[in-house]
Amino acid sequence: APPPINKLALFPDKSAWCEAKNITQIVGHSGCEAKSIQNRACLGQCFSYSVPNTFPQSTESLVHCDSCMPAQSMWEIVTLECPGHEEVPRVDKLVEKIVHCSCQACGKEPSHEGL
Amino acid sequence: APPPINKLALFPDKSAWCEAKNITQIVGHSGCEAKSIQNRACLGQCFSYSVPNTFPQSTESLVHCDSCMPAQSMWEIVTLECPGHEEVPRVDKLVEKIVHCSCQACGKEPSHEGL
């Protein structure tokens, strides 16, 4: 995939942006007590463009799309108490903790690399 | 797909934008004389966000991505002269003429409806 675009010559006053915003996330599981944890969400406006196609195609289709997604995250265990379940008194949930975000190719699987 | 997002409560001063810019497009084919035609390209900054995931998933994955792409286009024939080809003196190429553009779900096939 081509590298993300941060600036466009046609719109010199416009810049791509993609931020990691602090959020409070509610982690729940059926029959268990929910927990609130501090996390981050990715939010932004990345560039995209689409140049008209031809048939037969003269060149590669000139379509570009970036999306604001996790650039680095790690998955942690959050243990929930489940008082009504004798057999399963605690349940582990895996939660994606987002470290930072960036504009990346839209089709790309979000990166879940550790630090 | 959820409807495109034009405004975000978190960033009231930010707006999604997606424009149809006039361009001169060169239409060519091997062994034929290229033609310049007037066309439009889509270009913009649509919103995207990614909320941290969990395992097992409590809800649908909260990932949203809009991309600037043709909202309406039509395909026209452009005929090229091919002087060196006695057998095939002319070649027809189909060219996508973009009418207007909008922020649409990233995975969506661009709309190529006629007028």
Epitope: I77, R90, V91, D92, L115 | F55, P56, Q57
Partner: antibody, heavy 120, light 110 residues
Framework: EVQLLESGPGLVKPSQTLSLTCTVS??????????WSWIRQHPGKGLEWIGY???????YYNPSLKSRVTISVDTSKNQFSLKLSSVTAADTAVYYC????????????WGQGTLVTVSS | QSVLTQPPSVSAAPGQKVTISCSGS????????VSWYQQLPGTAPKLLIY???KRPSGIPDRFSGSKSGTSATLGITGLQTGDEADYYC???????????FGGGTQLTVL
């Protein structure tokens, strides 16, 4: 008492896809208190987590294998399956299916294991 | 190379006590529960200890677990010849975003 049994070909050619199925008996895969796992053990070596699935179909894969792994569940047959694509000799191992008691790293029940050899 | 470090082998006489260490870091043992597994020759692993120090039903109290900082320890008292096996520690590693195991320790009862 729950029992898990792995099944599938013991020999897979390089670059092909390894496919294994785990049949669960003595308990329902749909009971919400459990996560179902695949783990492998290379000959004479330690254990390696491959991934998890919940009865709803929600999955989690080891990032080191994620690009090649698919785990799926068939609640009607009380089975869950592993597919590992583009295999090489380094994927030769004993593959275990297992059940965790809703604790990610607490593997309470194991299958007997099945040896898969990758060779042409 | 395993993320969690265990001694390759330990040995002791019948009736004696033995400990097996499992060393990690803050991203794994330091912030997560540890489990221990016993693997007898030619069989699947079996859960011995979970949540650092809890025993599943059916596991004798000769087996114990503890955790301090970024290390965990499995203790076995009153050694029996039937305890000869490979022992593995396991936990979650948040930096790797994966479950991890130690390389295993072979216990020999002399």
């Amino acid at each position: 008492e729950v029992q898990l049994l792995e099944s599938g070909p013991g020999l897979v050619k390089p670059s092909q896809t390894l496919s294994l199925t785990c049949t669960v008996s003595g308990g329902s895969i749909s009971s919400g208190g459990y996560y179902w796992s695949w783990i492998r053990q290379h000959p004479g070596k330690g254990l390696e987590w491959i991934g998890y699935i919940y009865y709803s179909g929600s999955t989690y894969y080891n990032p080191s294998l994620k690009s090649r792994v698919t785990i799926s569940v068939d609640t009607s047959k009380n089975q869950f399956s592993l597919k590992l694509s583009s295999v090489t000799a380094a994927d030769t191992a004993v593959y275990y299916c297992a059940r965790t008691n809703s604790r990610i790293t607490m593997i309470a029940d194991w299958g007997q294991g099945t040896l898969v050899t990758v060779s042409s | 190379q395993s993320v969690l470090t265990q001694p390759p082998s330990v040995s002791a006489a019948p009736g004696q006590k033995v400990t097996i260490s499992c060393s990690g870091s803050s991203s794994n043992i330091g912030n997560n529960y540890v489990s221990w597994y016993q693997q007898l020759p030619g069989t699947a692993p079996k859960l011995l200890i979970y949540d650092n120090n809890k025993r599943p039903s059916g596991i004798p109290d000769r087996f114990s677990g503890s955790k301090s900082g970024t290390s965990a320890t499995l203790g076995i008292t009153g050694l029996q010849t039937g305890d000869e096996a490979d022992y593995y520690c396991g936990t979650w590693d948040s930096s790797l975003s994966a479950g991890v195991f130690g390389g295993g320790t072979q216990l020999t009862v002399l």
